[in-house]
């Protein structure tokens, strides 16, 4: 995408506060980086709804991220 | 009940300037991106900026960027679209909608937005 400058976040503002946990098909965690100095959350829909952006701060975004984590580690 | 309603469109001559406005209600305007879309007759609906009501981060599509300049006034929940050096080819119904949650990579896709408004008329006389 040639409009949007380097080291740019991924989610334009604070993202969605939650998403139905039925239409979650995968979440990605994205750390802060050189790029983005904040935490994302990224949510694939199902059925090819695209993603979405789901506010980090959110009570759903903190339990995601906990999920991710111990899986993880 | 969600509101945006656009003003400013009018008839200018090219090489002229307009500023659209978008008056946002019924919902936490923080929260949300708003974009700028035009359509001309025969056209498909055309994404030509976005802004981040939160952090006042724009991103502009390469036919506009240098004459399109998006701003927001949080205050009155309200964003801008100035238009400079107005061409014949900018004539069109502009529309701004709202959109949350949305990636950099859907800034420009009517389809990821929410909500929009009635649009307001553009026409540029050579």
């Known amino acids: 995408f040639p409009m949007f400058k380097r080291g740019r976040c991924l989610c334009i503002g604070p993202g969605v506060k939650a998403v139905k946990v039925a239409d979650i098909e995968k979440a990605s965690i994205m750390y802060p980086s050189n790029n983005c100095d904040k935490i994302e959350v990224i949510i694939t829909l199902k059925e090819n709804k695209g993603q979405r952006c789901l506010n980090p701060k959110s009570k759903q975004a903190r339990l995601i991220i906990k999920k991710v984590e111990r899986k993880n580690f | 009940e969600v509101q945006l309603v656009e003003s400013g469109g009018g008839l200018v001559q090219a090489g002229g300037s307009l500023r659209l406005s978008c008056a946002a209600s019924g919902f936490t305007f923080d929260d949300y991106a708003i974009g700028w879309f035009r359509q001309a007759p025969g056209k498909e609906r055309e994404g030509v900026s976005c802004i981040s009501s939160s952090d006042g981060d724009t991103y502009y599509a390469d036919s506009v960027k240098g004459r399109f300049t998006a701003s927001s006034d949080n205050a009155k929940n309200t964003v801008y679209l100035q238009i400079n050096s107005l061409k014949p080819e900018d004539t069109a119904v502009y529309y701004c909608?709202?959109?949350?949650?949305?990636?950099?990579?859907?800034?420009?896709?009517?389809?990821?937005?929410?909500?929009w408004g009635q649009g307001t008329q553009v026409t540029v006389s050579s």
């Open positions: 909608a709202a959109g949350q949650g949305l990636l950099i990579a859907q800034a420009l896709r009517w389809e990821s937005y929410d909500y």
